[in-house]
């Protein structure tokens, strides 16, 4: 071939977003006379993205000095590539023409695709608490990244789940991408420890996935179960109730005693047991002054836990006959656990 | 200093082909284009086309597609221009030329030209 | 193509005067892109100016050009006998590069 050729040696470029990508082109002539002009895309839409005669490119600098005699060297390196400067690139000779240039002939396009990392993989879980046996979704969202591969997993507790439902957009080509994850978890009481993780492994991450992660503590509500017994006498004319509210999440709870359906008194849990699985334990008495009632009281402990509906538990306490021929006052008093942070 | 030899006249007839030359000295003869130009007779001059010897490559005025063809020859620093189907119309001086640049503006040196007379 | 048009074709002038020429493109030509030759009888053509008003090496302070545009010019502000010769205009602003047909200068 005797005349020239415009050569593009790579068809494709992969560039990680931020760096340099250099787009080689080489002339085999300096005829026809006339510039060089580098553009991104084919036809009337193209992006003039260098043009060695004029004007101003300040990411753009040519690989080899263009003014110097002989050079058919013509390759470009662009400075700092973000997503949106993926395309195809064309080296394109011109030829000297009057009153314009006229386009000549292309080189074949180098297409540059850009890496660019996916962002931290944010993690929601529902809005509501569900109890457990009950289906709760976590969502996975992460934005930003090319190529459109990627691979997203579930975790809980270290053991892979299988029910999810993954989406990555757009669906057609794009300068980058959204991957957006849905996965159900089934809740078990002892998920107040648990742990769901988000992992996305892309091929910028060089092996090292980036993970997101959510506690199921935000998303589980454990009931509490409620016992009422009455402990041994102080004193002839006392009796001691306890009742012991156990194994609840979160930690708002409300008690209220009621002595035959009336309100005796109420309190907020404060000082808490924590236990193992990270639920907690919480003890009320009431000690009742049986001088002062001739019949038999019907005690009940009632929890509003966590602002659902209240639970109850009722305890009947025996008047014998010698006590209900004395009256007296009923004192109250609440045992306090050691506490321990939620 | 640049000197550009040219090949001496030449009578050919109608039909024909020629092949003249142009022989440059005084300067890297791979690193400039050559152009080449024709005279007829009491006329202006008319550009042919060019050739770059570097890579032995060539870009022609349209209207002598066909007609003349460029080569060149590194190693003896010669250019030469085939002319072929010769007609009367191809009477003329031919004349090799090198811009003052090497890839153009204008032509500081010419060679003394080569008479081209077809006749039967 | 783009065409250069000299005017006038021929003149002829006596020594000393100052003679003008002009060429005319057809399409606009940068100034860098306009150049002048001379040419003898039975010689190849000789830089005159280059880039519409430079001198090339060794010719006359008394040849100067000017123009811009579509519209150029070749002055000589006093004519010698060794002058005599016709001059072209030559644009390389488009392929394929253009002449303009010659003035002939005759020196009366």
């Known amino acids: 071939e005797d005349e020239l050729q415009v050569i593009q040696p790579e068809k494709s470029v992969s560039v990680a977003a931020g760096e340099s990508a250099t787009l080689r082109c080489a002339m085999t002539s300096l005829i026809p006379v006339g510039p060089i002009m580098w553009f991104r895309g084919a036809g009337a839409g193209r992006e003039l993205i260098y043009n060695q005669k004029e004007g101003h490119f300040p990411r753009v600098t040519t690989v080899s000095e263009l003014t110097k005699r002989n050079n058919l060297d013509f390759s470009i390196s662009i400075s700092n590539i973000t997503p949106a400067d993926a395309g195809t690139y064309y080296c394109v000779k011109f030829r000297k023409g009057s009153p314009d240039d006229v386009e000549f002939k292309s080189g074949a396009g180098t297409e540059l695709s850009v890496r660019a990392k996916p962002s931290a993989p944010v993690v929601s879980g529902p809005a509501v608490r569900a109890t457990p046996e009950h289906t709760v979704s976590f969502t996975c969202e992460s934005h930003g990244f090319s190529p459109r591969d990627i691979t997203l997993k579930w975790f809980k507790n270290g053991n892979e789940l299988s029910d999810f439902q993954t989406n990555v957009d757009p669906a057609g080509d794009s300068v980058s991408y959204s991957i957006h994850s849905t996965a159900r978890v089934v809740l078990t009481r002892g998920d107040v420890h648990s742990q769901v993780i988000c992992e996305i492994a892309h091929i910028t991450l060089q092996g090292d996935p980036l993970r997101g992660t959510a506690n199921l503590s935000e998303a589980i509500r454990v009931p509490p179960t409620l016992e009422v017994t009455q402990q041994p006498m102080r004193a002839e004319n006392q009796a001691n109730v306890t009742c012991q509210v156990s194994n609840f999440y979160p930690r708002g709870l409300q008690l209220t005693w009621l002595e035959n359906g009336n309100v005796s008194r109420t309190e907020t849990a404060s000082t808490l047991i924590e236990n193992k699985d990270g639920t907690y334990n919480w003890m009320s008495w009431l000690l009742v002054n049986t001088c002062a009632h001739r019949d038999d009281v019907v005690l009940t402990c009632q929890v509003e836990h966590d602002g659902q509906q209240a639970v109850s538990k009722s305890y009947a306490l025996e008047i014998s006959a010698h006590q209900k021929e004395h009256g007296s006052d009923i004192t109250h008093e609440a045992a306090l656990a050691p506490t321990a942070p939620l | 200093q640049v000197q550009l030899q040219q090949s001496g006249p030449e009578l050919v007839k109608p039909g024909a082909s020629v092949k003249m030359s142009c022989k440059a000295s005084?300067?890297?003869?791979?690193?400039?284009?050559l152009s080449w130009v024709k005279q007829r007779t009491g006329q202006g001059l008319e550009w042919i086309g060019e050739?770059?010897?570097?890579?032995?490559?060539?870009y022609y005025n349209e209207k002598f597609k066909g007609k003349a063809t460029l080569t060149a020859d590194k190693s003896s620093n010669t250019a030469y221009i085939q002319l072929t189907s010769l007609t009367s119309e191809d009477s003329a001086v031919y004349f090799c030329g090198r811009f003052y640049d090497y890839d153009g503006g204008w032509f500081a040196y010419w060679g003394q030209g080569t008479l081209l007379t077809v006749s039967a | 193509e783009n065409v250069l048009t000299q005017s006038p074709e021929k003149m002829a002038v006596s020594l000393g005067q100052k003679v003008t020429m002009t060429c005319s493109a057809s399409?606009?030509?940068?100034?860098?892109?306009l150049h002048w030759y001379q040419q003898k009888s039975g010689a190849s053509p000789k830089p005159l100016i280059h880039?519409?008003?430079n001198l090339a090496s060794g010719v006359p302070a008394r040849f100067s050009g000017s123009g811009s545009g579509t519209s150029y010019s070749l002055t000589i502000s006093s004519v010698e006998a060794e002058d005599a010769a016709t001059y072209y205009c030559q644009q390389w602003s488009g392929y394929p590069w253009t002449f303009g047909g010659g003035t002939n200068l005759e020196i009366k």
């Open positions: 050739i770059y010897p570097g890579t032995i490559t060539t």
């Open positions: 399409s606009s030509v940068s100034s860098s892109d």
């Open positions: 880039g519409t008003s």
């Open positions: 005084g300067y890297t003869f791979s690193e400039y284009v």
